[in-house]
Amino acid sequence: MAVTACQGLGFVVSLIGIAGIIAATCMDQWSTQDLYNNPVTAVFNYQGLWRSCVRESSGFTECRGYFTLLGLPAMLQAVRALMIVGIVLGAIGLLVSIFALKCIRIGSMEDSAKANMTLTSGIMFIVSGLCAIAGVSVFANMLVTNFWMSTANMYTGMGGMVQTVQTRYTFGAALFVGWVAGGLTLIGGVMMCIACRGLAPEETNYKAVSYHASGHSVAYKPGGFKASTGFGSNTKNKKIYDGGARTEDEVQSYPSKHDYV
């Protein structure tokens, strides 16, 4: 029961985690910037992995997608790759874990097969969660190291003067969603791996052994069947024959003075 609960909970936690990773990957708020309060209106910028957006206090919002692949920063490409790998692994893990669930019966699937599938999905969830956490952390590190506070280093460009806009780059909501989702997927994966141990069948087979006392405990019943004492039922290897004949499992019982007809 505990194994089923652990497996089921691991599945649900991973499902929520992967949904979160997908949500974080699609979100636009990975990086948010408060672009100075200019004389017109408060301009708020935010960027995601796929597009950049501008929002103004007037209510105007516009987003533009990154239509080029080659020109984008390598870090952004790396984060995209990590998030996509996380989603793909997580999705495959979910698919595998559905069939591995103890509460779902598929044909004559053995417990050992379910245990292996549970372990496989658990490992996939762990890797998926790590990918998401790594992706979000790489992006966060990129913000911290490069953009935390842009300094107004002015230099001359071809068309005149160029300066970096005084902007404070902060962590967007997507980063927190990604961290939490990655963590949940990781926890779910660990739970699946723990459940796998409980699902694995024990390999110890105990042979039914019948113990008989010598002589005095063996009686011939009127019906001609020998009554056997001891532990275990006479269903596996033992047949009781008329006249008290022994089977291959039995030890010969010799008549004694206590025997009676």
Partner: nanobody, 122 residues
């Protein structure tokens, strides 16, 4: 490389009109706020007008009601329609634009043009 090129300046009589243009070119991803700043002879920089991507505008008190700022987002072009010009409007007019580049959409820069001279004299 990004360039901001102003045009339309020249000599005009008081009460006359001029239309300045500023064209931004290069590997621009998105232009945010654009504006006009002027520098009269022997004086400091004075902001004239600004416009956001969503067309919210604001003007310096000295030009309110006389100047109109506008932009064409699709062409990355900024305009300044100057009417009822006065002698005190004589200055070099610079356009500036807050933009990010296609190669790094996560960092914003302010680019400035070389300026165009407007002379109001009779």
């Amino acid at each position: 490389q990004v360039q901001l090129v102003e045009s339309g300046g020249g000599l005009v009589q008081p009460g006359g009109s001029l239309r300045l243009s500023c064209a931004a070119s290069g590997s621009i991803f998105m232009i945010n706020v654009m504006g006009w700043v002027r520098q009269a002879p022997g004086k400091g920089l004075e902001w004239v007008a600004v416009i956001t991507r969503g067309a919210s505008t604001n003007y310096a008190d000295s030009v309110k009601g006389r100047f109109t700022i506008s932009r064409d987002n699709s062409k990355n072009t900024l305009y300044l329609q100057m009417n009822s010009l006065r002698a005190e409007d004589t200055a070099v007019y610079y356009c500036n634009a807050d933009l990010n580049l296609a190669s790094d959409p996560f960092k914003w820069y302010t680019y400035w043009g070389q300026g165009t001279l407007v002379t109001v004299s009779s």
